[in-house]
């Protein structure tokens, strides 16, 4: 009975290994809401997929507890900057948990991309990448936020994205 | 008979797990061809290796279908820039598939690094990192392209590289 | 006897798979020593953890040989720059091995972030991310170095970090 149980467990593990949780969500025209909320993402079209994770209002929702490598890239760009050279961009991955009322910072970057544009009419591009391993419980959510989101450039889902996989 | 089959399958899976596909390719003097093609990479010397993936003319070639975390970093630098502050660099990972005649953009970054050289010295450095999970079929290929590749600096294989592993 | 051995091996593997080596270490006030040594890291508090890897004086120490995706991000920032606009930052992951007296470069980035600050009193932010797959033997160590570390900004463990997981 014990060995049979172990056997079942192994079979189960093999099956679950086949669907090791992973996701890659892509930027879309609807990603930037301007509402102060997190970025929204495409979950099905093109390169986007969900496997063993779910999605809700910008958040990757964990269904199986464990350690996950989570990542996000955002494409930044503009013609000049809203606050000139002093403009700072904060790009972060944040956790929402039922056990705590506020979002928790997981991985964060700050950049001053506008120093690259020495006049108000100068076109500039920059990119911010974040990635790291965090522990997530079932039901917890991860979202991406960018402040100032006016500087995020979206096009075809290849330049701004958000993903995770269990390690 | 069934259990024996399952047993064989588990044994097989254990062996394949031991060779979970992974690769890390490094930049070399021959990486930049100037031909308009993708960057070429070192596959064996130093830190470079291929495990369960193959290589052909700059491309990582998939032998086992699945979801892969693919990544690339390029070291950028120069003395001034060919187009001044307007110089833009596009660094991307692209998929080649037998089912489609053109390369497909997977992950892309655009940067304007030349604003980093604002003093008389004109010397600047920048770096671009890309990483994300994509689904790849057996026989499909992934390549790295950089436009303008004149701004890529190669030295010892640690500053510009390209890799992947199955998740 | 053979099958029982295989069974034990599978059970063992399942257990070891449950503890696939992984770690995420976070920046802390004590990270910057100014001694010329590597950065030091928080290993337990907050988001930091070690699972199947150990830590010693800034180094992730490998206990199980294999291929690892190693990564680090450092948050850079300042008011002006110590060497003016020409300041270059080198951020790297380095291997220490008992078989060789010197550290070996694994993944390295160079950046000139200060070109973003067009006057000596200008505040600027930048970020450097590195990640890639390397083979590590049991007992080998990986450390993070940043030159010039005066430009690294630490706050709460989310902006500068160091991690790894076996692939």
């Amino acid at each position: 009975d014990g060995p049979a149980g172990s056997w079942e467990q192994l079979i189960q593990e093999r099956r679950s290994h086949e669907v090791n949780p992973a996701a890659h969500l892509t930027g879309a025209n609807s990603s930037l809401t301007g509402s102060g909320g997190p970025l929204l993402w495409e979950t099905q079209l093109g390169l986007a997929f969900l496997r063993g994770l779910s999605y809700h209002d910008g958040a990757l929702v964990v269904t199986k507890a464990g350690y996950y490598y989570i990542y996000s890239k955002v494409q930044l760009g503009g013609v000049g900057c809203p606050l000139g050279l002093a403009s700072t961009i904060t790009h972060g991955l944040y956790k929402r948990t039922p056990r705590y009322p506020e979002e928790l910072e997981l991985l964060v970057s700050q950049q001053s991309p506008c120093g690259r544009a020495t006049s108000s009419s100068r076109v500039w591009w920059d990119s911010s990448f974040l990635g790291g391993v965090v522990h997530l419980e079932a039901g917890e959510e991860v979202v991406v936020r960018v402040l100032d989101e006016r500087l995020v450039r979206l096009r075809d889902g290849t330049r701004s994205y958000f993903g995770a996989f269990m390690v | 008979d069934g259990p024996a089959g399952s047993w064989e399958q588990l044994i097989q899976e254990r062996r394949s797990h031991e060779v979970n596909p992974a690769a890390h390719l490094t930049g070399a003097n021959s990486s930049l061809t100037g031909s308009g093609g993708p960057l070429l990479w070192e596959t064996q010397l130093g830190l470079a290796f291929l495990r369960g993936l193959s290589y052909h003319d700059g491309a990582l070639v998939v032998t086992k279908a699945g979801y892969y975390y693919i990544y690339s970093k390029v070291q950028l630098g120069g003395v001034g820039c060919p187009l001044g502050l307007a110089s833009t660099i596009t660094h991307g990972l692209y998929k080649r598939t037998p089912r489609y005649p053109e390369e497909l953009e997977l992950l892309v970054s655009q940067q304007s690094p030349c604003g980093r050289a604002t003093s008389s010295s004109r010397v600047w450095w920048d770096s671009s990192f890309l990483g994300g999970v994509v689904h790849l079929e057996a026989g499909e290929e992934v390549v790295v392209r950089v436009l303008d590749e004149r701004l890529v600096r190669l030295r010892d294989g640690t500053r510009s590289y390209f890799g992947a592993f199955m998740v | 006897d053979g099958p029982a051995g295989s069974w034990e091996q599978l059970i063992q593997e399942r257990r070891s798979h449950e503890v696939n080596p992984a770690a995420h270490l976070t920046g802390a006030n004590s990270s910057l020593t100014g001694s010329g040594g590597p950065l030091l890291w928080e290993t337990q508090l907050g988001l930091a953890f070690l699972r199947g890897l150990s830590y010693h004086d800034g180094a992730l120490v490998v206990t199980k040989a294999g291929y690892y995706y190693i990564y680090s991000k450092v948050q850079l920032g300042g008011v002006g720059c110590p060497l003016g606009l020409a300041s270059t930052i080198t951020h790297g992951l380095y291997k220490r091995t008992p078989r060789y007296p010197e550290e070996l470069e694994l993944l390295v980035s160079q950046q000139s972030p200060c070109g973003r600050a067009t006057s000596s009193s200008r505040v600027w932010w930048d970020s450097s991310f590195l990640g890639g797959v390397v083979h590590l033997e049991a007992g080998e160590e990986v450390v993070v170095r940043v030159l010039d570390e005066r430009l690294v900004r630490l706050r709460d463990g989310t902006r500068s970090y160091f991690g790894a997981f076996m692939v």
Partner: antibody
Framework: QVQLVQSGAEVKKPGASVKVSCKAS????????MNWVRKAPGQGLEWMGR????????NYNQKFMGRATFTVDRSTSTVYMELSSLRSEDTAVYYC????????????WGQGTLVTVSS | EIVMTQSPATLSVSPGERATLSCKAS??????????MNWYQQKPGQPPRLLIY???NLESGIPARFSGSGSGTEFTLTISSLQSEDFAVYYC?????????FGQGTKLEIK
């Protein structure tokens, strides 16, 4: 083939301004930097600065800052160098020189324009 | 600014012989393994002509008898077998820092 054709010789009085043109052909004009270099009698070559035709961005040798102005007319693939407050020591042959593919050398040059400053 | 010093000021060499011209920079002109040093030839009434870029790269269309070497602060232009058309003034030029600066020139004359 690549050609840079400059405007003709000029004679100017001290305090006046001169504007020299350099018309490019035979290549994609906006892809290459244009530099200005002068050679005074009995002197060596002196770099005055550069212009990026793609954007109009300019970098000047500090020595000429405030007196030299580089402009571009992309419609005619022409760059201009204007030098004001002329003095006798500005008497020289002025050259435009195209930035090479690797942009930190000058691979094609105009034939030169002699500017004489004399009262 | 970076000062470029060429020597000798005048070099007299017979046709068919080898000529070696030197150029010293007041500070290193190297970046990431490349030297930002160029050599030009100028004849009377003509614009300069690029011979060597990045210290040792021969410009397209320039005869192989011209070669460049050096790194850091010391550079050499060598003409292996002088032809009659090689007698001219030669300038070195650094491009690592603004303002770009030239040496004062070496006049290569027929001996």
């Amino acid at each position: 083939q690549v050609q840079l054709v400059q405007s003709g010789a000029e004679v100017k009085k001290p305090g006046a301004s001169v504007k020299v043109s350099c018309k490019a052909s035979g290549y994609t004009f906006i892809d290459h930097i244009m530099n200005w270099v002068r050679k005074a009698p009995g002197q060596g070559l002196e770099w005055m600065g550069r212009i990026y035709p793609v954007s109009g961005e300019t970098n000047y040798n500090q020595k000429f800052m405030g007196r030299a102005t580089f402009t571009v007319d992309r419609s005619t693939s022409t760059v201009y160098m204007e030098l004001s407050s002329l003095r006798s020591e500005d008497t020289a042959v002025y050259y435009c020189g195209r930035g090479s593919y690797y942009w930190n050398a000058m691979d094609y040059w105009g034939q030169g324009t002699l500017v004489t400053v004399s009262s | 600014e970076i000062v470029m010093t060429q020597s000798p000021a005048t070099l007299s060499v017979s046709p068919g012989e080898r000529a070696t011209l030197s150029c010293k920079a007041s500070q290193s002109v190297d970046f990431d393994g490349d030297s930002y040093m160029n050599w030009y030839q100028q004849k009377p009434g003509q614009p300069p002509r690029l011979l060597i870029y990045s210290a040792s790269n021969l410009e397209s269309g320039i005869p192989a008898r011209f070669s460049g070497s050096g790194s850091g602060t010391e550079f050499t232009l060598t003409i292996s077998s002088l032809q009659s058309e090689d007698f001219a003034v030669y300038y070195c030029q650094q491009s690592i820092e603004d303002p770009w600066t030239f040496g004062q020139g070496t006049k290569l004359e027929i001996k």
